[in-house]
């Protein structure tokens, strides 16, 4: 049989699987496809892993290429490094193996590049345009344990058929990841279904021990049992249910405890109640009720948008400042007129369509119509404990291969990155709020006070302006998003690239797998927490069209109208902010609930690194973050350095209060 037949195939070891998908995709589409299944593009970092990839790929035709998880942003050449400036999609550059087709050449590498593996010969690595749709891609899935393939028994009618959690069905596995199902057909006409489960004594194993196909006491009808029939010593039979099910009152059929479970998003059998609830990517369990899920802020992902980002429930949107327009990739901004508006629309229709009604998207946009303020100033992130953003399956690597160099080094411009997903036994869950820590350089005293948008009482939906809202005292803590705390480090601004360290958005498009049932979420619930605002600086409330006297020549200002709002210091409960500089208490703007508009998007400036260096040394030097694939766009000219009012002042707002262009997205990625 042609190894390049249309069916995907996989090779698994005790702790990870590689899967080959012979589907023509661009790098971005391939990366997204792996993520949707709970994995990542393959990262063969050792000769042993490369050997497994080789055996999986086999001897394909010379014309066939497969994406692996290596990407390099424009002008990021580092030819002396083993990966030549390329970064794994898991966010790091450590490797004990490379297989480049050619020696490094000293070119300027002006464009973004991605790596594909040749399907033939020695499976060499080639670099090329990320927008080419190559013949397929390799995904990698990590897990906590695996069950060995079942031994064939005398009474079997054929080999066991295995189904993995990433939906590959085959008889050809040596190891089966935790969560796989084995179906065994016996010659006597009945069969058994086994699940690779956690064992009480630790580790994982099959839910039932063999032999599976002996005896006739349960013949001919499986003893009337829906799942498993057990022959007792005295000759009578009793029924059992496979893991995750319980025996019904009739003693024969099996019930799924999740069928009645009140989980808002996802349910997994097991646990003291017979089930446990989990949240989809982009959501986390509500603290007051683990059955419910609350939104997480995708705009915390570095590079998710080149300039500005708005978060809403289950998704996000990208925007560009006035004079710029959104490129076709939905992320990058280029000076107005650099590409046709129709092209952007075409791509929106072709590439980003996830089956949602355009009317719905328009409605979502109308809810955010008016002025806004970018997150004040420019942030420099230090890695913090990443959110417990648990996927059951992800590439996992031994601890000793975590990078031993501080990240980033002064000579290594940091990639657009987000916290690396820790592996977890739950299918998809978020168990603690996001805490993003930032530092801000000490700058000369203020010429411009911090700017926040106003709340307007009783504005029509078409005229609502997004609000930077305080924590709602009357809402349960589950509705409170992660805190963005900003502190200051004495660094001159010229040498610090803006970085925002963040998390992945929800990645479940319309063609969802059974593992992730489709759940549509409407509405917006976002809160932005401002850092300390010194008492001598009254916050300004932005309104469209209002005039402001000229500022210092180096300051880019929003059109604003000065309006005093009370500043109420509030303590943030149970929050661990990691920073090398003292963190000022959060001052938050109290907004009467009655005046809050329906949609409260959070806008963050997002700057992709160019050839700049960063002097930051991380709090957790070995924490790594997934590299977010994105297509290159021109570097934005938006990030002007603005003075800061005082050592603990909120950084000043940046950009013009005019929406140039936006990209509406929910569960679509880039």
């Amino acid at each position: 049989q042609d190894p390049w037949a249309a069916e995907p195939r996989a090779a698994c070891g005790p702790s990870s699987c590689y899967a080959l998908f012979p589907r023509r995709r661009t790098f971005l589409e391939a990366w997204r496809a792996c993520r949707e299944l709970g994995g990542d593009l393959a990262t063969p970092r050792t000769p042993e892993e490369a050997q497994r990839v080789d055996s999986l790929v086999g001897a394909g035709p010379a014309s066939r290429l497969l994406w692996i998880g290596l990407q390099r942003q424009a002008r990021q050449c580092q030819l002396q490094r083993p990966l030549r400036g390329f970064t794994w999609t898991t966010g790091d550059q450590d490797t004990a193996f490379t297989n480049w087709a050619q020696p490094a050449s000293g070119g300027p590498c002006p464009a973004q590049r991605c790596v594909a593996l040749e399907a033939s010969g020695e499976h060499r690595w080639l670099e090329g345009s990320c927008t080419l749709a190559v013949d397929g891609y390799l995904c990698q899935f990590g897990f906590e344990g695996a069950c060995p393939a079942l031994q064939d028994e005398a009474g079997q009618a054929g080999p066991a058929v295995y189904t993995t959690p990433f939906h590959l069905v085959s008889t050809e596995f040596e190891w089966l990841p935790f969560g796989s199902v084995a179906a065994v057909q016996c010659q006597a006409g009945r069969g058994a279904s086994l699940l690779c489960v956690k064992q009480p004594e630790g580790g994982v194993g099959w839910s039932r021990a063999g032999p599976l196909c002996l005896g006739t006491g349960c013949s001919p009808d499986n003893g009337g049992c829906e799942h498993e029939c057990v022959e007792e010593v005295d000759g009578h039979v009793s029924c059992r249910c496979t893991e995750g099910f319980r025996l019904a009152a009739d003693g024969r059929s099996c019930e799924d405890p999740c069928a009645q479970a009140p989980c808002e998003q996802q349910c997994e059998p097991g646990g003291p109640q017979g089930y446990s609830c989990h949240c989809r990517l982009g959501f986390r369990p509500a603290e007051d009720d683990p059955h419910r899920c609350v939104d997480t802020d995708e705009c915390q992902i570095a590079g998710v948008c080149q300039q500005m980002c708005v978060n809403y429930v289950g998704g996000f949107e990208c925007y560009c400042s006035e004079g710029h327009e959104l490129e076709a990739d939905g992320i990058s901004c280029s000076p107005a007129g650099a590409m046709g508006a129709q092209a952007s629309q075409d791509l929106g229709d072709e590439l980003l369509d996830d089956g949602e009604d355009e009317e719905d998207e328009d409605e979502a946009w109308k809810a955010f119509n008016g002025g806004w303020t970018e997150m004040p100033g420019i942030l420099w992130m230090e890695p913090t404990q990443p959110p417990d953003f648990a996927l059951a399956y992800r590439p996992s690597f031994p601890e000793d291969r975590e990078p031993q160099i501080p990240y980033p080094e002064p000579t290594w411009p940091p990639p657009l990155s987000a916290p690396r997903v820790p592996y977890h036994s739950s299918v998809l869950s978020v168990t603690r709020p996001v805490v993003v820590s930032a530092t801000h350089p000490t700058l000369p005293s203020a010429h411009q006070p911090p700017v926040i948008p106003a709340t307007h009482p009783a504005l029509s939906r078409d005229h609502q302006i997004p609000v930077i809202a305080a924590n709602y005292p009357d809402l349960p803590s589950a509705y409170q998003p992660g805190i963005l705390s900003v502190s200051h480090s004495a660094q001159p601004p010229a040498h610090q690239p803006p970085m925002i360290s963040t998390k992945y958005p929800e990645l479940f498009p319309a063609h969802q797998s059974p593992m992730f049932p489709d759940t549509r979420v409407a509405g917006t619930q976002t809160t932005t927490h401002l850092p300390g605002i010194p008492p001598n600086h009254a916050p300004l409330v932005t309104t469209l069209g209002a005039q402001l006297p000229p500022q210092a020549p180096d300051a880019l200002v929003l059109r604003t109208q000065a309006t005093q709002l009370p500043i109420i210091p509030t303590a943030q409960p149970s929050l661990t902010t990691t920073s090398r500089s003292p963190v000022s208490p959060a001052h938050q703007i109290s907004v009467p609930a009655a005046t809050q508009p329906a949609a409260l998007p959070t806008l963050l400036p997002s700057q992709s690194p160019t050839n700049q260096t960063s002097p930051i040394s991380p709090t957790h030097p070995h924490s790594k973050a997934p590299q977010i694939p994105r297509e290159d766009g021109p570097s934005p000219k938006l990030a002007l350095w603005l003075p800061s009012p005082a050592p603990t002042a909120a950084p000043t707002a940046l950009g013009e209060a005019g929406l140039a262009e936006h990209s509406q997205r929910d569960d679509r990625w880039l």
Epitope: S63, R64, S129, E350
Partner: antibody, heavy 124, light 108 residues
């Protein structure tokens, strides 16, 4: 050395089917995709579609879908273009071209070798 | 479909002149852009692939640059044998290959 050679009837009557042959030599035929490109007299280049001889996988320009059929015969290293229900608009030079795979450590899908072209006139 | 808008449609220059042709893609095609030369009565020849890489045997006076949507092809010193029509082409496969309209280069 790599060579591609188109051949065809030269003259085809309107509404009939045009058949062109592209014979490849100097390389492993199944390792490279074959493209077909149309160039009407005095005009620019227009992509018709491609076929991968390894597995007969085809991709067509939407404009030619339904009218063009691409096939290969591996044993003779030949690729075929059939264009049904031709009109005067189909009068053109037709090229077959090979899609490159990689050069100097880069993968790339540009057309690295072209045939000399075959002029087909559609006229009654 | 991805459109490739090439300009100018024709130009005249003297031997030794620097000649520049531009091409704009209607959407981001990364670096999946080639430049082809077609002399009268002949088949096109590949000069530049992947936006900026010179194909084997192509003289160094030919160069290309750009990524995303804007691309430039340059002949640093025009020679008599460079009289031809030059085409840009995108080949992302997404959804199809397309060519620019062509630029006819003549010598004054």
């Amino acid at each position: 050395q790599v060579q591609l050679q188109e051949s065809g009837p030269g003259l085809v009557r309107p509404s009939q089917t045009l058949s062109l042959t592209c014979t490849a030599s100097g390389y492993t035929f199944t390792d490279y995709v074959i493209h077909w490109v149309k160039q009407p007299p005095g005009r620019g280049l227009e992509w018709i579609g491609y076929i991968n001889p390894y597995d007969d996988d085809t991709t067509y320009n939407q404009k030619f879908k339904g009218q063009a059929t691409l096939t290969v015969v591996k044993s003779s290293n030949t690729a075929y273009l059939r264009l049904s229900s031709v009109t005067a608009e189909d009068t053109a030079v037709y090229y077959c071209a090979r899609r490159g795979n990689s050069y100097d450590g880069y993968f790339d899908y540009s057309m690295d070798y072209w045939g000399q072209g075959s002029l087909v006139t559609v006229s009654s | 479909d991805i459109q490739m808008t090439q300009s100018p449609s024709s130009l005249s220059a003297s031997v030794g002149d620097r000649v520049t042709i531009t091409c704009r893609a209607s959407q981001n095609v990364g670096t999946a852009v080639a430049w082809l030369q077609q002399t009268p009565g002949k088949a096109p020849k590949l000069l530049i692939y992947s936006a900026s890489n010179r194909y084997t045997g192509v003289p160094s006076r030919f160069s290309g640059s750009g990524s995303g949507t804007d691309y430039t092809f340059t002949i640093s010193s025009l020679q008599p044998e460079d009289i031809a029509t030059y085409y840009c082409q995108q080949y992302t496969n997404y959804p199809m290959y397309t060519f620019g309209q062509g630029t006819k280069v003549q010598i004054k």
